[in-house]
Interface confidence: medium
């Protein structure tokens, strides 16, 4: 695995992995993994990767199927990091509503909202 | 606040009553609130709303204002509501193999992503 | 507690096998990747591969593909790591040690060692 | 394979000194960096991962920091009880690969 791969070099590739090895991962007929039911997906991280770290102990390991988790932790990292830098800045409240306002006009034209 | 307002209708409120009470909610130069430094909001729901605690403490609250905060509060309790189900079902591989798909497909084309 | 408790200390004459056993309690077994990693005296630490106790997938090291297995029996919470074809450098302290997480390939319990002696 | 160049190989220092010993991975490895203690006759012991997490229950005295290909590994004031082999492990990718390791002894 190259390490400078961009995050979104790394995304692409672990799209084309997961495609691969889409028929080894559901082997496991009787396996159940906590799934979502909507799709703002940045609001399930956590649980998306608790999931991946269900199927990886239930997964034949070795070769590209490896390079497949070893991507997903990568993106995790990088997930990580970004979390991190949710509350690392103290700025002006002027700062902070612009900041809100956008996250609303975010939710307002792209989430999927089921009231 | 009608009790069953859909939430769309509820951010598109919210929003509007952010730009007239923006003068007011500014009034503290000395505040610091912790703004993320992306725009990937949906990572940072949660400091995102510890902001909104802290701005509400600071602010003279009456009339609209006070609308605001309520509707504000409404919509946390929408996204915690999200939260929760992140992680409600359990379902085949397959199922969480599209969800996975999907959050990279999202992050993929949409995410603002620095390597 | 987290335990790895691994089989006593063996002597084999050249070209014999050995199988070093390494029983787990205080988690569930297949939850967790075991890894064996070795220690010739004096010298530092070679990582040998790795054993899925669910899945029954490994990945071995290709300094040691040919000469080695990694099995487990879920029913007693053991994995066990077979070394082949042994010669007088396989002498070494053996260890099984788990891996801390599956986004993280680190070792956060191991075994107390079993010594294997090649000679002769 | 990664090759994981640690320094020195050995050190000598005095009780609350503070100690350094560095790691240099051959190829980049983000921050996928382990620090071992290992003691005669013991199994090693973990003491930092992901290059500057604290393991559970591991004094604050010990400490980690890097990224990419160097990698650095603190003792703030060296206690008797840290007279030991310390080993610094990637975790890239397979095959895992150790540093040769460090001595530490007491002045």
């Known amino acids: 695995i190259p390490t400078e791969i961009p995050t979104s070099a790394l995304v692409k590739e672990t799209l084309a992995l997961l495609s691969t090895h889409r028929t080894l991962l559901i082997a496991n007929e009787t396996l159940r993994i906590p799934v979502p039911v909507h799709k703002n997906h940045q609001l399930c991280t956590e649980e998306i990767f608790q999931g991946i770290g269900t199927l990886e102990s239930q997964t034949v390991q070795g070769g590209t199927v490896e390079r497949l988790f070893k991507n997903l932790s990568l993106i995790k990292k990088y997930i990580d990091g970004q979390k991190k830098k949710c509350g690392e800045e103290r700025r002006r409240v002027n700062q902070f509503l612009d900041y809100l306002q956008e996250f609303l006009g975010v939710m307002n034209t792209e989430w999927i909202i089921e009231s | 606040i009608p009790t069953e307002i859909p939430t769309s209708a509820l951010v598109k409120e919210t929003l509007a009553l952010l730009s007239t009470h923006r003068t007011l909610l500014i009034a503290n130069e000395t505040l610091r609130i912790p703004v993320p430094v992306h725009k990937n909001h949906q990572l940072c729901t949660e400091e995102i709303f510890q902001g909104i605690g802290t701005l509400e403490s600071q602010t003279v609250q009456g009339g609209t204002v006070e609308r605001l905060f309520k509707n504000l509060s409404l919509i946390k309790k929408y996204i915690d509501g999200q939260k929760k189900k992140c992680g409600e079902e359990r379902r085949r591989v397959n199922q969480f193999l599209d969800y996975l798909q999907e959050f990279l497909g999202v992050m993929n084309t949409e995410w603002i992503i620095e390597s | 507690e987290v335990q790895l408790v691994q089989s006593g200390a063996e002597v084999k004459k050249p070209g014999a096998s050995v199988k070093v056993s390494c029983k787990a309690s205080?988690?569930?077994?297949?939850?967790?990747?075991i890894h064996w990693v070795r220690q010739a005296p004096g010298q530092g630490l070679e990582w040998m591969g790795y054993f899925n106790p669910n899945s029954g997938g490994s990945n071995y090291n290709e300094n040691f593909k040919r000469r080695v297995t990694m099995t487990r029996d879920t029913s007693i919470s053991t994995a066990y790591m077979e070394l082949s074809r042994l010669r007088s450098e396989d002498t070494a302290v053996y260890y099984c040690?788990?891996?801390?997480?599956?986004?993280?390939?680190?070792?956060?319990?191991w075994g107390q060692g079993t010594m294997v002696t090649v000679s002769s | 394979d990664i090759q994981m160049t640690q320094s020195p190989s050995s050190l000598s220092a005095s009780v609350g000194d503070r100690v350094t010993i560095t790691c240099l991975a051959s190829e980049g490895i983000s921050n996928d960096v382990a620090w071992y203690q290992q003691k005669p006759g013991k199994a090693p012991k973990l003491l930092i991962y992901a290059a500057s997490r604290l393991q559970d229950g591991v004094p604050s005295r010990f400490s980690g920091s890097g990224s990419g290909t160097d990698f650095t590994f603190t003792i703030s004031s060296l206690q008797p009880e840290d007279i030991a082999t310390y080993y610094c492990?990637?975790?890239?990718?397979?095959?895992?690969?150790f540093g040769q390791g460090t001595k530490l002894e007491i002045k």
């Open positions: 492990q990637q975790g890239y990718k397979t095959p895992l690969t």
């Open positions: 205080g988690y569930t077994f297949t939850d967790y990747i």
């Open positions: 040690a788990r891996r801390i997480a599956w986004d993280h390939w680190y070792f956060d319990f």
